[in-house]
C-alpha cells in the first residue's frame, strides 16, 4: 500500500528489544512510517538510564530512524526507605529491588509497633507497595502504657517508684518552677495548662527531662519544646476548667523501658474510671514532710464521687467550680493525694482488656492542704479532650 518516493529509502527493519514489542509490524517502513515500542509489564522504556513513558520512531528521508531503539529494562524500585526505629529485610534476595521483589519492614520489638504486616512488593509503577496499596513506608509507632508497676502501693502517703514503673513521667523545669507531664507520643507531652501557661510564648526556656526516677539525677534524657499548645477554653487565673496543654518536642525521643508514652483512653475507658475505681499518680511534688520529693513517688488513689467532691469544694472555696471536665480522686479519710510540684502529671489507670496503662486525669488543683480528709485532688478529665488532643497532634 506504500508508494515509494524516489528520493527516500526504506528504513531498516526494527527489532524489538528484549522484553519489548513493536507496533505496528510492517513488511517495509518508508518515509514518515512510524513504530512504537511497548515493554512487558514490570519493564520500563529507557534511553540509557533516562526513563521514557512512550517511544515512537519515525522513518526519515535518508532511510534512517529518527531515534535509536530504547531498552526495556526491568523496573527497579531502588533501595527502600529507611524505617526509623525499625529495619527492612530483603526477602527475594540480598539487595534485590527489581519488579516483584519482596521486602519486609519490621519495628524494634517490644517498644515499637506497626499497624500493617510490613510486607511490600516492588510494583510496575516503580514504587514499593503494601498489600493495601500504600506507597509510603510503614511507621513504627511507639508502644504505649507498658509498666512494671502493679496496683497495690500504699507524693503524700506515697512510696518510691521503681525503674520502669512510670516511663511516661516527664519533669518540666522552668527557671524557678517545677511541674510534670506525661509522654503520650514520641514527640508530644501532655500536661496541665496552668503549669506551662507562663512559658507559652517562650517554650524554649522550658527544660524537659525524662527517663529518671531521682529528680536531680544527672542521667536524664533531655528534650526541648518546639511549641506549647494551651487549650483555648482555659483562662489563666479564673478557675481550672480545661486545664490541659500539649507540648510538641523538637525531636522524637527513643522509646525504651524507662521512656515510653502512656496510652490515651479508649472510648470504653470511662467505665474504668467510675467512683471507687483506683488510679495511680506519680510525681516529684511535696510529700507529707512538706518537701519536694527527691525520688519519684507514687500513690494509688480511688476516684471520688463527683457530687461529693463538688459539694466539698463549694463549701471550702465558694466560687471555685468542679466542672464536668474534671474528676476527683482521694480518700475521704485523707492521707493520699498529689500536691504542689506534681501538677501536669498523669493519673493513670490499668486497662484490663489491653493490659496497658492509660491517662485518665492530669494533676490540676486541689485544697492547699494536700491529703487532707474530705479534700480531694482534682484532675483534668482527659477522656473529654481526646478530639482536641488528636486534632492538635494531627495538625502540628
Amino acid at each position: 500500500h506504500h508508494h515509494h518516493h524516489h528520493a527516500s529509502r526504506p528504513c531498516p527493519d526494527p527489532t524489538a528489544p528484549p522484553n519489548g514489542s513493536i507496533s505496528p509490524v510492517q513488511a517495509i517502513y518508508v518515509l514518515k512510517d512510524r513504530f512504537s515500542v511497548f515493554c512487558k509489564t514490570g519493564f520500563e522504556l529507557l534511553q540509557g538510564s533516562v526513563p521514557l513513558k512512550s517511544f515512537t520512531a519515525v522513518c526519515q528521508k535518508d532511510g534512517s530512524w529518527d531515534r535509536p531503539m530504547p531498552e526495556c529494562s526491568i523496573i527497579d524500585c531502588g533501595p527502600p526507605d529507611d524505617l526509623p526505629n525499625g529495619h527492612v529485610d530483603y526477602i527475594t534476595g540480598p539487595e534485590v529491588t527489581t519488579y516483584k521483589a519482596v521486602i519486609q519492614y519490621s519495628c524494634e520489638e517490644t517498644f515499637y509497633t506497626m499497624s500493617s504486616n510490613g510486607k511490600y512488593v516492588c510494583e510496575a509503577d516503580g514504587f514499593w507497595t503494601s498489600s493495601k496499596g500504600e506507597k509510603l513506608p510503614p511507621v513504627c509507632e511507639p508502644v504505649c502504657g507498658l509498666s512494671t508497676h502493679t496496683i497495690g502501693g500504699r507524693i503524700v502517703g506515697g512510696q518510691p517508684a521503681k525503674p520502669g514503673d512510670f516511663p511516661w513521667q516527664v519533669l518540666l523545669l522552668g527557671q524557678t518552677t517545677a511541674a510534670a507531664g506525661a509522654l503520650i507520643h514520641d514527640n508530644w507531652v501532655l500536661t496541665a495548662a496552668h503549669a506551662v501557661y507562663e512559658k507559652r510564648m517562650a517554650a524554649s526556656s522550658l527544660n524537659i527531662r525524662m527517663g529518671i526516677l531521682k529528680r536531680l539525677s544527672p542521667h536524664y534524657t533531655q528534650a526541648w519544646p518546639e511549641e506549647i499548645f494551651i487549650h483555648e477554653g482555659y483562662t489563666h487565673g479564673a478557675g481550672f476548667d480545661n486545664d490541659i496543654a500539649l507540648i510538641k518536642l523538637k525531636n522524637k525521643v527513643t522509646i525504651n523501658g524507662s521512656i515510653m508514652p502512656v496510652c490515651l483512653p479508649r472510648k470504653e475507658a470511662a467505665s474504668l474510671m467510675r467512683t471507687d475505681f483506683t488510679g495511680t499518680v506519680a510525681g516529684w511534688g511535696l510529700t507529707q514532710k512538706g518537701l519536694l520529693a527527691r525520688n519519684l513517688m507514687f500513690v494509688d488513689i480511688p476516684i471520688a464521687d463527683h457530687q461529693k467532691c463538688t459539694a466539698v469544694y463549694e463549701k471550702l472555696y465558694p466560687g471555685v467550680r468542679v466542672s464536668a471536665n474534671m474528676l476527683c480522686a482521694g480518700l475521704e479519710t485523707g492521707g493520699k493525694d498529689s500536691c504542689r510540684g506534681d501538677a501536669g502529671g498523669a493519673l493513670v489507670f490499668l486497662d484490663n482488656e489491653t493490659q496497658r496503662w492509660f491517662v485518665g486525669g492530669i494533676v490540676s488543683w486541689g485544697s492547699i492542704n494536700c491529703g487532707a480528709a474530705d479534700q480531694y485532688g482534682v484532675y483534668t478529665k482527659v477522656i473529654n479532650y481526646i478530639p482536641w488532643i488528636e486534632n492538635i497532634i494531627s495538625n502540628f
Epitope: 534511553q47 540509557g48 538510564s49 533516562v50 526513563p51 521514557l52 513513558k53 512512550s54 531515534r67 535509536p68 509503577d125 516503580g126 514504587f127
Partner: antibody, heavy 114, light 107 residues
Framework: DVQLQESGPGLVKPSQSLSLTCTVT?????????WNWIRQFSGDKLEWMGY???????SYNPSLKSRISITRDTSKNQFFLHLSSVTTEDTATYFC???????WGHGTTLTVSS | DSVMTQSQKFMSTSVGDRVSVTCKAS??????VAWFQQKPGQSPKGLIY???YRSSGVPDRFTGSGSGTDFTLTISNVQSEDLAEYFC?????????FGGGTKLEVK
Amino acid sequence: DVQLQESGPGLVKPSQSLSLTCTVTGYSITSDYAWNWIRQFSGDKLEWMGYISYSGSTSYNPSLKSRISITRDTSKNQFFLHLSSVTTEDTATYFCARYWGDYWGHGTTLTVSS
Amino acid sequence: DSVMTQSQKFMSTSVGDRVSVTCKASHNVGTNVAWFQQKPGQSPKGLIYSASYRSSGVPDRFTGSGSGTDFTLTISNVQSEDLAEYFCLQYNSNPLTFGGGTKLEVK
C-alpha cells in the same frame, strides 16, 4: 513550544535550605520524560543533580543524596529542587532541563554567603 | 561513575575549517552520549543525542559519532557563530556525568 523557567531566592545563608522551582510550559511534566536539575559552577563545570520522571520516580546524584530532594506539583506543572545544609560550595547557576537536555531553562544564579 | 574526559580545554579554528571535539568515557556507555553548545551567558543547547542523532533545528554541519568509550563531535565548515564551549554528557547510567568542556575559538 516547550519552555522551562527556574526561580529561586538568589542568596542563601550557609547551613540553610534551598528551594528552587522550575515552571514548565508547552508540555506536561506527567506526559513523558525525566525532568532534571543541573548546576554549573563558576569554572563552567556542569553537575547533574537528579531528576524526577513523568511517573514521579526520582534519581539523585549519590554525591548529594543525603541533602537533595526533587518533588513536583502536577497541577501547576512545576518541579522543585530542595537542597539542605547548603555551603559556599553550592554557589552556582542552577538549570532545569528535560530528558537528556533537549530543552533547558535560562538558569538561576544562587549565592551562598553569610 | 562514568568519568567523561574532554582532553582539549581549548581549540582554535578558522571559519570554513572542519574541527573535531573529542570525549572519552571511563566505562562503556554504549551510544548514550549527548553534545551541547554553550555560548557565554546562555544555557547549554542540545546538539546531538544518542551519539549521532542531530537534535531538531541543529545545522547539519554538526555531526556526532562514536560508541562505547570514544566519542567525537565534528563541525564541518565552521561559522563564526560556532564560537562557544562544547560539552559531552553520558546518560547511560546514573549519575549522569558531563565532560569538562572544550572552548572553541574562531580565528
